[in-house]
């Protein structure tokens, strides 16, 4: 399937001009290669009329141009002074020959329709209303007023001043006069449909002295806006239906032959195909709203329509807006699994992609919630503290410049299962959707911390060890101290030459962390984890409480003393100086404001690595929002 996209049908009138926009995938080669517009002949040959190389055919001389917009990945063909001879089949495309990537465009140029100059013309969009003005002479003021619609043979009554109304206009048509003006009457018709289009006659009086006026009512279907989006990226449908439907339920549907299947509405309906990757957001009181879909799939391509009606379903005679969505399969967004699997008590490390050109953008992770219109409250971000209920078990690791940041969630429970979005404050196309599945653990965790009852005494030495299996032998092991701003990896350096070993003793693989002397600042969550380069793997967490020597209380007044930690990897002794100052002995991110919800986010379904048989709980209470439980092991 060609990744070039444009309008399938273009219609115009003799003498007018058209502009045809064609979209191409975002690659350097495409931006610089030849663009062309050619006309298809009966033989299948496509004759170039204009190209970006500067070629211009004789018949287009002085009336056409082709402009490339590399920043938008589009090129535009402008043709002026159209004649009926321009009607035909064309291609817009890329490549050195006209057999390259292309899109078929049909152009139809019609004759100029002239109208009688006494015609009153009204042009209205579907679903709107029209007020037709019908002037008459003063002598016809007492006479009957009426509006009828012309059919082949006759003129069918719509409404008259004796309150007769055609059944198909009941509740929609009103005949009235304004103030004391006795020379004009008005007919208002609401909820206009295609069937209302046509010629009408308004009349005051009877016989030869009657006042008659020809009225031409055009009811316009909305022109679909073309949207060109990459596979796995996101799309936002911005729907502006006007103040008159501000209080009605809103919907987005996708055309399916003759019907339009609702994908989402503000009454809570949602197509299961879009579970976890769609939000609908009312914008204001003027009937504006938006629908965001992430994780675009090729089957999402098609014709979309938004509208408003109390039923939340498409209804004739109500305002609509339409789009034609094209999903480009030559996507710049990396293809990753869309499901991460973890086990209870274990951990997952999710690699979130972002546009590598925007390494300084703020990164976020939010949890999609389907209730109501759908929303995505931020759980963690580069400048957003971790939500309180995720204390000690969620962190975001930014790796500037490589196009990926990692979100780690440990101490998993089945309640963590659901959909999560990776997003940044930069290029919205790179938002990705991950489904997290959490199964009950059936085996021992890969990482285990001892002792599990972790209470350190102020001023003394305290060591915790993290046991890992042989399969992690070649990976980098680390300890980090968690705070609601991230997990600060404790610096370490080798002090002795490490013995190379071919065999691996399952019982002796451990990485230890020593706090010496224990300071009250050392209280908090610590993670033991493995990683390979910038690729994070499993983690496990432990809460270390700090008590004074004489009392059992774990509450300590803060001081500025820096903690000292030693991290020992197998036989090596690693000294690491921790100088993390925290305001509280137990990190508390404070209430996480709901305003931080990212409501209009989501772009592409994707996912990342997770450990299949992920690491373990450490015996701590996992009700992380209840900090006092941490000390009763």
């Amino acid at each position: 399937k060609s990744p070039i996209f444009g309008p399938q049908e273009v219609s115009s009138i003799e003498g007018d001009s058209v502009s045809i926009t064609c979209y191409y995938p975002d690659t350097s080669v495409n931006r610089h290669t030849r663009k062309y517009w050619c006309r298809q002949g009966a033989s299948g040959m496509c004759t170039t009329l204009i190209s970006s190389n500067g070629y211009l055919s004789k018949e287009y001389s002085g009336r056409a141009n082709l402009i490339n917009f590399p920043e938008n990945n589009t090129f535009v063909i402008n043709i002026e002074q159209l004649t009926q001879d321009d009607t035909g089949s064309y291609k817009c495309g890329l490549g050195t020959s006209n057999r390259g990537l292309s899109f078929d465009v049909s152009l139809e140029v019609s004759q100029v329709p002239e109208l009688p100059s006494d015609t009153h013309v009204y042009t209205k969009d579907i679903g709107r209303n029209v007020t037709i003005e019908c002037p008459f002479k003063r002598e016809n003021a007492p006479s009957k007023k009426s509006l009828c619609k012309k059919t082949n043979q006759s003129c069918e009554l719509v409404i008259d001043s004796t309150e007769k109304v055609n059944p198909s206009y009941i509740g929609r048509a009103k005949l009235f006069m304004k103030g004391t003006d006795l020379t004009v009457f008005y007919v208002n018709i609401s909820h206009l449909t295609h069937n209302d289009a046509g010629l009408y006659i308004c009349q005051a009086g009877e016989g030869p002295s009657a006042d008659k006026k020809n009225v031409d009512l055009q009811v316009l279907a909305p022109e679909p806006e073309l949207l060109y989006k990459d596979l796995r990226s996101s799309v936002t449908f911005e729907c502006d239906l006007g103040r008159e439907v501000a209080n009605e339920a809103k919907y987005l549907c996708r055309m399916n032959k003759e019907t339009c299947d609702v994908i989402i509405n503000t009454l809570g309906k949602r197509d299961p195909d879009f579970e976890g990757r769609i939000l609908i957001t009312p914008k204001d009181d003027n009937g504006r709203f938006s629908v965001l879909i992430t994780g675009l799939r090729k089957e999402d391509a098609g014709h979309y329509q938004c509208g408003a009606h109390s039923s939340g379903l498409p209804q004739e005679g109500w305002p609509i807006q339409t789009w034609q969505l094209f999903v480009n399969e030559e996507s710049t967004i990396p293809n990753r699994r869309s499901v991460v699997k973890g086990v209870t008590g274990g951990s997952v490390a999710i690699a979130c992609p972002y546009n590598p050109k925007e390494s300084s953008s703020l990164k976020y992770w939010c949890r999609w919630e389907g209730d109501g219109n759908g929303h995505c409250p931020v759980l963690v971000g580069t400048q957003a503290q971790v939500q309180e209920e995720y204390e000690g078990r969620l962190a975001l690791f930014d790796q500037p410049g490589n196009g990926t940041y990692t979100v780690i969630l440990n101490q998993l429970t089945t309640e963590d299962a659901g959909f999560y979005w990776c997003l940044t404050n930069g290029d919205s196309r790179w938002r990705t959707t991950i489904e997290l599945q959490v199964a009950e653990a059936t085996r021992e965790p890969n990482l285990e911390v001892t002792p599990q009852n972790a209470t350190a005494v102020l001023g003394e030495t305290f060591t915790v060890s993290c046991h890992y299996p042989c399969k992690f032998y070649s990976q980098e092991k680390y300890w980090c101290k968690w705070s609601n701003k991230g997990c600060h990896i404790l610096p370490s350096h080798d002090e002795g030459a490490r013995q190379s070993s071919v065999s691996c003793d399952q019982s002796s693989q451990l990485v230890s962390m020593t706090l010496n002397p224990v300071s009250k600042e050392d209280e908090g969550w610590y993670w033991c984890g493995v990683k390979q380069g910038q690729t994070y793997g499993e983690t496990t967490a432990i809460y270390i409480a700090v008590e004074e020597r004489t009392r059992g209380s774990s509450h300590v007044n803060p001081t500025d003393a820096n903690a000292r930690a030693k991290v020992a990897l197998e036989e090596e002794v690693v000294d690491s100086s921790i100088s993390e100052k925290e305001n509280k002995a137990i990190p508390n991110p404070g209430p996480f404001a709901n305003e931080r919800e990212i409501q209009n986010v989501g772009d592409q379904a994707q996912e990342n690595r997770a450990s299949g048989d992920a690491g373990s709980a450490d015996g701590q209470s996992r009700s992380s929002s209840s900090k006092h439980h941490h000390h009763h092991h």
Epitope: I13, Y122, L220
Partner: nanobody
């Protein structure tokens, strides 16, 4: 709110041609009728030509029929008035206006107006 800007006026000899442009901003002209009117000193404002944007149907006043052509460019949201075989009596300020509906030829049906562009025809 629609803003209209006319251009293309100027001095031309009788029998010559001019092309006036009316560029609209603020919103698409899709559901409007766009008309050209003219007003010579001491005279009433007079209808010249109009086009229904949605389907291109047009009306041209009898005095200019066959000489003046109204056309549109969707992408530029612009309407043109091609004036050929100009006569001294065509000299006037030409105004562009848009309407949501009503009588093509009646100026009161038009809601938004441009500032006008002067056309002078010398004999």
């Amino acid at each position: 709110e629609v803003q209209l800007v006319e251009s293309g006026g100027g001095l031309v000899q009788a029998g010559g041609s001019l092309r006036l442009s009316c560029a609209a901003s603020g919103r698409t002209l899709r559901s409007y009728i766009v008309g050209w009117f003219r007003q010579a000193p001491g005279k009433e404002r007079e209808f010249v030509a109009a086009v229904t944007w949605s389907d291109g149907r047009r009306v041209t006043a009898d005095p200019v029929k066959g000489r003046f052509t109204i056309s549109r460019d969707n992408a530029k949201n612009t309407v043109y008035l091609q004036m050929d075989s100009l006569k001294p009596e065509d000299a006037a300020v030409y105004y562009c206006a848009v309407s949501h509906g009503g009588a093509y030829v009646e100026s009161r049906a038009y809601e938004y107006w441009g500032q006008g562009t002067q056309v002078t025809v010398s004999s």
